[in-house]
Structures are given as structure tokens and as C-alpha cells.
Amino acid sequence: GPVPPSTALRELIEELVNITQNQKAPLCNGSMVWSINLTAGMYCAALESLINVSGCSAIEKTQRMLSGFCPHKVSAGQFSSLHVRDTKIEVAQFVKDLLLHLKKLFREGQFN
């Protein structure tokens, strides 16, 4: 059957932890991505931002997991109004910010 939302979120959090702790060289060669507003629709916005990073195996699983939280199909070059389009940050910082926010959502019971 389908994975419960709480389990899916916990697994996404654990995957982001694995990414941050296994960082030896700069994550995704220091690629920059658009910063996002960590609000409603955040999962799609995060996917839209990360999907523009190509050739980075370290975040491929994260991209797949985020797609499970986003109700619509996301493709490279697609951006929603949720992006703070004047700010780019390194993928590593993006992942750290996203991880902390998701841990707070988990605590608050916001699994979807």
C-alpha cells in the first residue's frame, strides 16, 4: 500500500541528513540554486529549484522523494511564484535549510 505521509517525511528528512553528513567535496560541485520561501507549496518549489541541478547523483534520491510530495509534474526550467528569484545559494546550504524546516514540520504534524 501507499507509504503513510509521516513515514515519507521521516524518510526524506533522513535522506537529507545522509547528504549533509557524507559531504566531502562541495555538494554538486558547489552548484547554485534559487532560494525558496519555506511556506505552503514548499515541496514543489524545492523540487523546481533542485531539478535544475544536473549530473549530481547525491541529490537524485532527494529529487525523487520530493516529487512524491508535489502534486504536479515538475520539469527543469519551471518556476513557481514561491521562488525568491533574486537569491541563489549553494545546494549544500539549500539542503541544510530545507532539512531544518522539515524537522519542524514533522514536529508540528504537518506531514503533507
Epitope: R10, E14, V17, L100, K103, F106, R107, G109, Q110
Partner: antibody, heavy 122, light 108 residues
């Protein structure tokens, strides 16, 4: 100002019971999860129990489960800990602690009482 | 149940930077809080949610949490920072709040 004041500590014989109370003031008690934390002399902090803001959920440390009961009265802004079948290893300072309530009570303890000493000795 | 491991003691000279670690399996997936306790006093929250600082706590205190280790960093250490420091997490699997064993910080 916001404060938590514990009472009810004292010296008690092994196997006997004791009831601790905590009076809260200066904040909206009914909107917070409440915990008991204890500290044996010269030892570290040990979490004892939690009760949800509305009293709907309680959880206990394995070391006290089945012997201690945490309750609250939101109309009187009080938290209680009923301690039965006390053992020498329950000797400690007991702190009443406040934590903002979420779906999961994973919040930090942002307000502590000064503690009340419980000594279990024959 | 979930176990948090801290070094029993850490020593530092005034004005230096010290780091107190808190180890736990995939602790990076949990929100970590840190407390300072001085002799005869109740603990005081110094860092919450991995890296946030209560308004009354000096900027010299900071926190991080990556992988299997959370870290409390105190910069420009003062004599008044001498205390016991405890890390804490909520263990979702057991519904228990868990404290580390505590680290005694001595300012030389």
C-alpha cells in the same frame, strides 16, 4: 512574571507514596505541554514524564512507568506527579518544566521551576 | 531507547573557543536543544531547534547538527560560562524525551 513553583517534596520510606505539585503562573498554562525532570545528587538530568496541553496524552520514562502518574488541572493551573512504590533510586530533585505544545512534544524546555527534593530512605 | 553521548568534561582557557559534542544515531534528523546548568540552579535553555538562540543568550553561543553529531560552540569563553551542559532530543519512536549525560565545562 512567568514561574513554576514545585511543592510536596520530602523524606519518605521505600515502598511508600508521595505527591508532587507544581503551581504555574504568569502564562496561559492550558496551552503548554508539561514535563517532570529529575536529577539525582551529583548526576545528570533525567526526563520523567510528559502530559499534553489538554491532558489527552501522557508518556513516562521506563524507570517510572507503572509507578508514577502525571496529571494536570487546567482550571487551577497545576501539574501533579503521583509517585507510588518509591525506591532509593528515585531520590532526586524534581523539576516541573514547561514546553510549547505541538503535534509532537519535541519542543525545548523554556521554563523550569527551582525544583523540590525527594529523598527515599529507610 | 535512543542514546545521546557527551564527553564528561571539557576544559578551555578564557577567551578561547570550545565545542561540546552530542552524539546520536542520525541525530541530524532530530531537533536538538542545549541547556546550561550552574551548581545549585535549575537548567537554562541556551540553544533550541539545533541552532536558534533565546533572546537573553549571548551571540557567543551557537549550535549545529549534522549527521550523527550535534555541537554546541561557545566563543570567547568567560569564567561565567563554567557549568554543566546537556543536549536533549525527543525520540519519536519511544515517545521519550532524552538527555545526554552532560558535559562539565571548566574554564581554566
Amino acid at each position: 512574571q512567568m514561574q513554576l513553583v514545585e511543592s510536596g517534596g520530602g523524606v519518605v520510606q521505600p515502598g511508600r507514596s508521595l505527591r508532587l505539585s507544581c503551581a504555574a503562573s504568569g502564562f496561559e498554562f492550558r496551552t503548554y505541554g508539561m514535563h517532570w525532570v529529575r536529577q539525582a545528587p551529583g548526576k545528570g538530568l533525567e526526563w520523567v514524564a510528559v502530559i499534553w496541553d489538554d491532558g489527552s496524552n501522557t508518556h513516562y520514562a521506563d524507570s517510572v512507568k507503572g509507578r508514577f502518574t502525571i496529571t494536570r488541572d487546567n482550571s487551577k493551573n497545576t501539574l501533579n506527579l503521583q509517585m507510588n512504590s518509591l525506591r532509593a533510586e528515585d531520590t532526586a530533585v524534581y523539576y516541573c518544566v514547561r514546553a510549547p505544545q505541538w503535534y509532537l512534544t519535541a519542543e525545548a524546555f523554556d521554563l523550569w521551576g527551582q525544583g523540590t527534593m525527594v529523598t527515599v530512605s529507610s | 531507547s535512543y542514546i545521546l553521548t557527551q564527553p564528561p568534561s571539557v576544559s578551555v582557557a578564557p577567551g578561547e573557543t570550545t565545542r561540546i559534542t552530542c552524539g546520536g544515531n542520525l541525530i541530524g534528523a532530530k531537533l536538538v536543544h542545549w541547556y546550561q546548568q550552574k551548581p545549585g540552579q535549575a537548567p537554562v535553555l541556551v540553544i533550541y531547534d539545533d541552532s536558534d538562540r533565546p533572546s537573553r543568550i549571548p551571540e557567543r553561543f551557537s549550535g549545529s547538527n549534522i549527521g550523527n553529531t550535534a555541537t554546541l560552540t561557545i566563543e570567547d569563553v568567560e569564567a561565567g560560562d563554567e557549568a554543566d551542559y546537556y543536549c536533549q532530543v525527543w525520540d519519536y519512536s519511544s515517545n521519550h524525551m532524552v538527555f545526554g549525560g552532560g558535559t562539565k565545562l571548566t574554564v581554566l
